[in-house]
């Protein structure tokens, strides 16, 4: 069977939303009203990986676009891309570690982990209107805890 | 024993608000995803709102998006529904029950609240 | 959305008979499918997942099967106990649905 995908939009902890910015890049900011349509929806794919009750692996696709959130090392640091993918072979149940994220939710708390980097989190800026990218800090100032609101397909 | 048990079901006019509660025991509320499925006098059931394990997560159908609000307090081990702008066609016996999104089933159900939307 | 169709709405049968329920879905749903009964006055209760596992303490009477989209449920011999109303639901994209249910009386 092919891997099952659901579709959602993500929310920071400061309630900013995700939209596109640029071809290949997110940013955060906050969203009212018909605005909300701008907000990027995912369709987040239940992939091949350590799984716990705390903890699903999982690839975040924009819905209907060959694009996929991916952590590489860009100048010896982890970094948060938009990449392009082959729409025949993507979602598959197997992604590569780079395409596959630890969904943890604890106490309330919704965060990204990437697979391929340990404690590095998909995160967003105090700032408004700044890039969503891959942090390395829990608890400082940038802020790593996201809610998950499903949506029909 | 697993238990799920409503409350707060009945008799409201259109437009008005309604929370319905589930307390749960026999087993660890905090680890499990929960929603809300009714069922409309003699028709089938609807699943009608959901909530991740730490509340974290949602999900809504079209037919009570924006008026519905699901959640959680999982230190009283408790589910609830919050009702707005209620409508004749949200009339149902409402059921409390363990699963959602993920697993995608429901493997332990209330014996159900009745709402009854009515001028 | 993937809408399931169930089918019979309502049969008869006899203590001991073999009963088979059919639901069909719109579109493929890879056996993430599951069977409820509810009976008269009480809530549903989960009987068969992903298709043709048995939940916890249900009878092996009761078996699940699929063939492409088409999903059908079994009683090997039916018990006066399994009066009921039945329902397919499937769980594959949002929103899952269930069944428009399948109504067992015994003659």
């Known amino acids: 069977a092919p891997v099952r995908s659901l579709n959602c939009t993500l929310r920071d902890s400061q309630q900013k939303s995700l939209v596109m910015s640029g071809p290949y890049e997110l940013k955060a900011l906050h969203l009212q009203g018909q605005d909300m349509e701008q907000q990027v929806v995912f369709s987040m794919s239940f992939v091949q990986g350590e799984e716990s009750n705390d903890k699903i692996p999982v690839a975040l696709g924009l819905k209907e676009k060959n694009l996929y959130l991916s952590c590489v090392l860009k100048d010896d640091k982890p970094t948060l891309q938009l990449e392009s993918v082959d729409p025949k072979n993507y979602p598959k149940k197997k992604m590569e570690k780079r395409f596959v994220f630890n969904k943890i939710e604890i106490n309330n708390k919704l965060e990204f982990e990437s697979a391929q980097f340990p404690n590095w989190y998909i995160s967003t800026s105090q700032a408004e209107n700044m890039p969503v990218f891959l942090g390395g800090t829990k608890g400082g100032q940038d802020i790593t805890d996201f809610t998950m609101q499903f949506v029909s397909s | 024993e697993v238990q799920l048990v409503e409350s707060g079901g009945g008799v409201v006019q259109p437009g008005r608000s309604l929370r319905l509660s589930c307390s749960s025991s026999?087993?660890?509320?905090?680890?499990?995803?929960m929603s809300w499925v009714r069922q409309a006098p003699g028709k089938g059931l609807e699943w009608v709102a959901y909530?991740?394990?730490?509340?974290?997560?949602?999900y809504y159908p079209d037919s009570v998006k924006g008026r519905f609000t699901i959640s959680r307090d999982n230190s009283k081990n408790t589910l609830f529904l919050q009702m707005d702008s209620l409508r004749a066609e949200d009339t149902a016996v409402y059921y409390c029950?363990?699963?959602?999104?993920?697993?995608?089933?429901?493997?332990?159900w209330g014996q159900g609240t009745p709402v009854t939307v009515s001028s | 959305g993937i809408q399931m169709t169930q089918s019979p709405s309502s049969l008869s049968a006899s203590v001991g008979d073999r009963v088979t329920i059919t639901c069909r879905a719109s579109g493929n749903i890879y056996n993430y499918l599951t069977w409820y009964q509810q009976t008269p006055g009480k809530a549903p209760k989960l009987l068969i997942y992903n298709a043709k596992t048995l939940a916890d303490g249900v009878p092996s009477r009761f078996s699940g099967s699929s063939s492409g989209t088409d999903y059908t449920f079994t009683i090997s011999s039916l018990q006066p106990e399994d009066i009921a109303t039945y329902y397919c639901?499937?769980?594959?994209?949002?929103?899952?649905?269930f069944g428009q249910g399948t109504k067992l009386q015994i003659t």
């Open positions: 639901q499937h769980f594959w994209t949002l929103p899952y649905t």
């Open positions: 026999g087993f660890i509320f905090s680890r499990y995803d």
């Open positions: 029950a363990r699963g959602g999104v993920y697993k995608g089933y429901f493997d332990e």
């Open positions: 909530i991740s394990h730490g509340g974290a997560g949602t």
